[in-house]
């Protein structure tokens, strides 16, 4: 049962690595660490170390999304950590690649029905208190491994089994073909190149780009929707401000994705949320009087 | 050892609204998924919904869509329900349950129940 | 919803005595299934998951078995202490849903 692989995993990541010869790359200082007779030491990275229980978070989140959508309960959660593990641990943290997480991918294999994908931009709040209300729309983060990793960080080490709970590479700092942002840029890729019909996005209104082409959404997620599957884009830029009443759909940046998208042969629709706090209250009661009016 | 500890009995006026707590302990809140379970007297029982503490996801079976709010507060492992427009036909027990994770998705662990009284 | 149909909805046997409670499903459940016993003024307690496994602390005497839309919970040698309604549940899809329950007594 779960307790046992815990039980099982605390064993080896804190008496596992010893065994095994270290060796380093990069420019990241050194740190000792352990308290055997040869001393040992660990790449110090500038981004954050691991999130705190990191493989109990991983396994108990598989077992929890499979006991609340019945339909992935085929999945084996034992084996879904460790294509997870085998993705990043005893590699460099710097050189991780897509085919890492092939694996892991794999096993996570869940389709979307046609026009019920919705992408999000530094917006994502907003985006997953919408498909709590609108069940049959689906972020990334909806999906199991989205879900398995949301909101989380991990790396290991080159040629030992310990996860790096000190710090991790850092995307700008470091290295951008580091665990995490490996993980999100193929779990992305396949998700949008999955999608069919009209896929949805959400845009931030208050950033001074609204679309960002260095974003995960405008580097990944524009360039792998299929022209063949997905017949339309349909932006929600959501105004932040009560009194903003102007047509951010005529931004340059919505401009510019307007033409990557089209030039892809997509259509591309944009609407204004004026109200986001209306918008959602309308999508869980769309019978109310006030929502016959725009939001 | 895991423990659901609910709050005690309520009685709640035609109209009004009551909310009941589970005290999770023994195990980390959020690695679990949190049910809630209606007993009406000598009646069977009838699944209201879940929540994932984690997340404050939530579902509900239709019937209790409009009756029944689910919330979770992380810092202080607790979840609630709070029951709104109590009606006679809310007068009942109400359950906090969860799985083991090794017990299927059967609900291995309850909380002792609280009596909602519905009268004027 | 998937209905689960309990039967019979009381019975009455003696010490010793073996009793079978059947439990069917409206649709095929796969071995998506629980029992629980519930003593007055008590919660419900899990006795077996995936429709034959014992819970634990659960006694041997407790057994299930069945899969799809057919199950039933026996119990040998009859005790005291199962003085008890039990339920069943499909844990296949949402909503979950119980059986109405079976009060055992003794004769």
């Known amino acids: 049962g779960l307790n046992d692989i815990f039980e099982a995993q605390k064993i080896e990541w804190h008496e596992g690595s010893h065994h095994h010869h270290h060796h380093h790359h990069g420019s990241g200082s050194l740190v000792p660490r352990g308290s055997g007779s040869l001393p040992r030491w660990r790449q110090q990275w500038s981004g954050s170390g691991t999130t705190s229980r990191f493989p109990e978070t991983v396994l108990a989140r598989c077992v929890k999304y499979t006991e609340v959508h019945p339909e992935m309960r085929h999945v084996d959660c034992q084996s879904v950590w460790d294509a997870f593990k085998g993705a990043f641990i005893s590699k460099y943290p710097c050189n991780i690649t897509e085919e890492d997480y092939q694996p892991l991918v794999k096993l996570g294999t869940q389709t979307v029905p046609c026009n019920k994908t919705l992408l999000w931009s530094r917006i994502k709040d907003l985006a997953h208190q919408f498909t709590q209300v609108q069940r049959d729309m689906f972020t990334l983060e909806d999906m199991l491994l989205g879900y398995l990793a949301d909101d989380l960080t991990w790396c290991g080490e080159f040629n030992t089994f310990e996860i790096n709970y000190q710090s991790c590479p850092d995307w700008r700092k470091d290295c951008s073909n580091n665990p995490v942002s490996v993980f999100w840029k193929t779990v992305s890729r396949r998700f949008a190149e999955t999608a069919c019909g009209v896929v949805h996005v959400m845009l931030n209104g208050s950033r001074s780009k609204i679309f960002d082409k260095n974003s995960t959404f405008g580097s990944v997620e524009v360039h792998n929707l299929q022209p063949e599957k997905v017949q339309a884009l349909e932006a929600w830029v959501i105004h932040g401000g009560r009194e903003d009443s102007r047509d951010l759909c005529q931004d340059p940046t919505i401009k510019e994705l307007e033409s990557i998208i089209s030039k892809r042969n997509i259509r591309f629709f944009c609407k204004n949320i004026y109200r986001p706090d209306k918008f959602l209250q309308c999508v869980k009661n769309p019978e109310d009087s006030s929502c016959l009016s725009g939001i | 050892e895991v423990q659901l500890q609910q709050s005690g009995p309520e009685v709640g006026r035609p109209g009004s609204s009551v909310k009941i707590s589970c005290k999770a302990s023994g195990y980390t809140f959020t690695d679990y998924i949190m049910h809630w379970v209606k007993q009406s007297p000598g009646q069977g029982l009838e699944w209201i919904g879940w929540?994932?503490?984690?997340?404050?996801?939530?579902d509900y079976a239709e019937k209790f869509k409009k009756k029944a709010t689910l919330t979770a507060d992380t810092s202080s492992s607790t979840a609630y329900i709070q029951l709104s427009s109590l009606a006679s036909e809310d007068t009942a027990t109400y359950f906090c349950a969860r799985s083991a994770h090794t017990t299927g998705f059967g609900f291995a662990y309850w909380g002792q129940g609280t009596l909602v009284t519905v009268s004027s | 919803d998937i209905q689960m149909t309990q039967s019979p909805a009381s019975l009455s046997a003696s010490l010793g005595e073996t009793v079978t409670i059947e439990c069917r499903a409206s649709?095929?459940?796969?071995?998506?299934l629980a029992w629980y016993q519930q003593k007055p003024g008590n919660s419900p307690q899990l006795l077996i998951y995936?429709?034959?496994s014992l819970a634990d602390g659960v006694p041997s005497r407790f057994s299930a078995s069945g899969s799809g839309t057919q199950f039933s919970l026996k119990i040998n040698s009859l005790r005291s202490e199962d003085v008890a309604s039990y339920f069943c549940?499909?844990?296949?899809?949402?909503?979950?849903?119980f059986g109405a329950g079976t009060k055992l007594e003794l004769k």
């Open positions: 995936d429709a034959n």
């Open positions: 929540i994932d503490p984690e997340y404050g996801r939530t």
């Open positions: 549940q499909q844990y296949n899809n949402y909503p979950y849903t």
């Open positions: 649709e095929d459940i796969y071995s998506n």
